[in-house]
């Protein structure tokens, strides 16, 4: 197995992936595979109402310099804590002793995953931008059950979100061969996202490619500059029992997600007054609505919290409430 | 594919209670909020409420208010509906229909479950 | 209690253009109340036409338009066709999660 796997991000769609040889491998090291695949933001991001009072903004950093596989928790819990840091106490004999046992357990053990438990892959002409041989196939444990599956419809409305789960690992994941050397750059990903990275090291290129059980680290990519910033207008509709309603778009890529917006707002000569309008609610409203709004000149801006903290805000829109006597609405309360 | 999969008919007496479900597919289950519709044999559209399986936060029609329970369970994908006490005015047939994702602009109900058929007799 | 209004009922020969129209009881409808249009056979699910205003659902042709007409949202098919006899439903988004649908328009093809 390649060993202390660091992943490190220099920029929004790059990610530096650097390893150590296997200490003990098995014959020659001819190359090395690497994978990597999209993971989901965390399904609780998505549900939780993040405007609730006590409800801590989930905190999400991109891989910072010199992460190992150890020290993946750091971008991988679900929220920041800041403890002192700490450095490793010197090794005893009996750890040194210990770590020597389970380097030549590891080995053997690997010869046993390799004839026992995977069917070697066939050669491949790897171009770096998908994976077109089978994956390596597990020996069947048994027949999957039967599933019933409903007959597909037309969706009525376009697949747009930005925030679609990732393709499964089996749908071609990207790959690239890295022949003599012990680091890749991986490019061409998205900004502000979670990827699960797969090493492994092969003493063999043909007829048939064998290579050691995988490696993993996970890396996030730096945030985009702009990517949470509302593009396009904020519209308003104002009801006749000076109820305005409120609309904006989502931005299109955020960082990981929008998890709440903040809206801003004031009327002429008054302070400036703030609401805040999570995920659930925006996926209700497209927006929010103002009750009760005393007549007068409105200004409010707009601005998204994505998992990598704020956009800007926009620019102000104006709107005007008349007065308006208290007449029973055709709105819902 | 995006679907919506409600249970299958069902034939209940008066008093009885009854729960029908709708499963989602192909979409993330829990950042959609999901709405229940009447219809009566030979009548139009009512709606009922809504509910987002997220926290299962609901929001009812005054008509419906105490009538029915909306209710989801996000690990399955699935919202259901339903009484603890028929009655022959809920024969009818009732249908989920998701609402408009977050990626599309306005207020709409666009993908419909099949439909789930409720007789209750007396 | 809001009422949503349509006509009961509508002829059009083939080929020609009907327009339907979705009315408030009390005040007048706007592109806030992000009109939808719905369509349904007998013995089928309701399909989606039309929503926010003016906005085709995937799939649905370009004789299906929707907009707004002096103070109440409209559906507009042109050239039509014998398999659009069907009803019409409009419904209006009257915030905080409610919908209000119309009594519906039985549209037939002569």
């Known amino acids: 197995v390649p060993l202390d796997p660091i992943s490190v991000s220099n920029s929004s769609s790059q990610i530096i992936l650097k390893w150590k040889p296997p200490s003990d491998p098995n014959g020659n090291i001819t190359h090395y595979l690497v994978f990597w695949e999209r993971q989901a933001e965390d399904s609780e991001l998505f549900e939780l109402d993040y405007c609730l009072k006590g409800l801590k903004l989930p905190s999400r950093t991109w891989s910072p310099p010199f992460e190992s596989e150890d020290s993946q928790k750091h971008n991988q819990s679900e929220y920041e804590d800041s403890a002192g840091e700490c450095c490793s106490c010197p090794k005893t004999d009996s750890q040194i002793l210990k770590e020597l046992e389970e380097s030549s357990f590891r080995k053997t053990f690997e010869d046993y995953l390799h004839n026992v438990v995977f069917v070697p892959r066939k050669t491949s002409s790897g171009t770096g931008a998908e994976d077109p041989r089978p994956s390596r196939k597990r020996r069947s444990l048994g027949d999957v059950g039967n599933v019933t599956v409903a007959v597909p419809t037309v969706a009525a409305f376009p697949n747009t979100s930005s925030t679609s789960v990732p393709t499964s690992p089996e749908e071609h994941r990207p790959f690239e061969k890295v022949v003599n050397k012990e680091s890749l750059v991986i490019s061409g990903l998205r900004h502000f996202t979670g990827y699960r990275i797969e090493l492994q090291a092969c003493n063999q290129d043909t007829p048939e490619e064998r290579c050691s059980v995988a490696a993993y680290v996970s890396a996030r990519t730096m945030p985009e500059a702009k990517a949470d910033d509302i593009v396009g207008p904020v519209t308003h509709e104002i009801f006749e029992n000076n109820v305005v309603h409120l609309m904006w778009q989502e931005p299109k890529e955020p960082n990981g997600l929008i998890v709440l917006y903040e809206v801003s707002y004031r009327r002429y000569g008054d302070e400036e007054l703030h609401l805040c309008v999570s995920r659930k609610h925006f996926a209700l409203e497209r927006g929010c609505r103002l009750r009760g709004l005393s007549p007068g000149n409105y200004s409010v801006r707009i601005r998204a919290t994505s998992l990598a903290g704020n956009g800007s805000w926009t620019e102000p829109t104006y709107f005007y409430v008349t007065d308006y006597l208290d007449v029973p609405s055709n709105i819902a309360k | 594919q995006m679907q919506l999969v409600q249970s299958g008919a069902e034939v209940k007496k008066t008093g009885e209670s009854l729960k029908i479900s709708c499963q989602g597919y192909g979409y993330r289950f829990t950042d959609n909020w999901i709405g229940w519709v009447r219809q009566m044999p030979g009548r139009g559209l009512e709606w009922m409420g809504i509910i987002y399986p997220g926290d299962s936060e609901t929001r009812y029609s005054p008509s419906f208010q105490g009538q029915v329970t909306i209710s989801a369970d996000k690990s399955i994908s699935t919202a259901y509906l339903e009484w603890s006490s028929l009655k022959a005015s809920d024969t009818a047939m009732y249908y989920c229909?998701?609402?408009?994702?977050?990626?599309?602009?306005?207020?709409?109900?666009?993908?419909w479950g099949q439909g789930t058929l409720v007789t209750v007799s007396s | 209690q809001t009422v949503v209004t349509q006509e009961p009922s509508f002829s059009v020969s083939p080929g020609g253009t009907v327009t339907l129209t979705c009315g408030l009881s009390?005040?007048?409808?706007?592109?806030?109340?992000?009109p939808g249009w719905y369509q349904q056979t007998p013995g089928q699910a309701p399909r989606t036409l039309v929503y926010n205003t003016n906005t085709r659902s995937s799939g649905v042709p370009d004789r299906f338009s929707g907009s707004i007409l002096g103070n109440k949202a409209a559906l507009t098919i042109t050239g039509a066709q014998a398999d659009d006899e069907s009803d019409y439903y409009c419904a209006l988004y009257m915030g905080s999660g409610t919908y209000v649908f119309g009594g519906g328009t039985k549209l037939t093809v002569l």
């Open positions: 009390s005040g007048s409808v706007s592109t806030g109340y992000s």
């Open positions: 229909a998701r609402h408009a994702p977050l990626a599309v602009a306005g207020m709409a109900l666009g993908d």
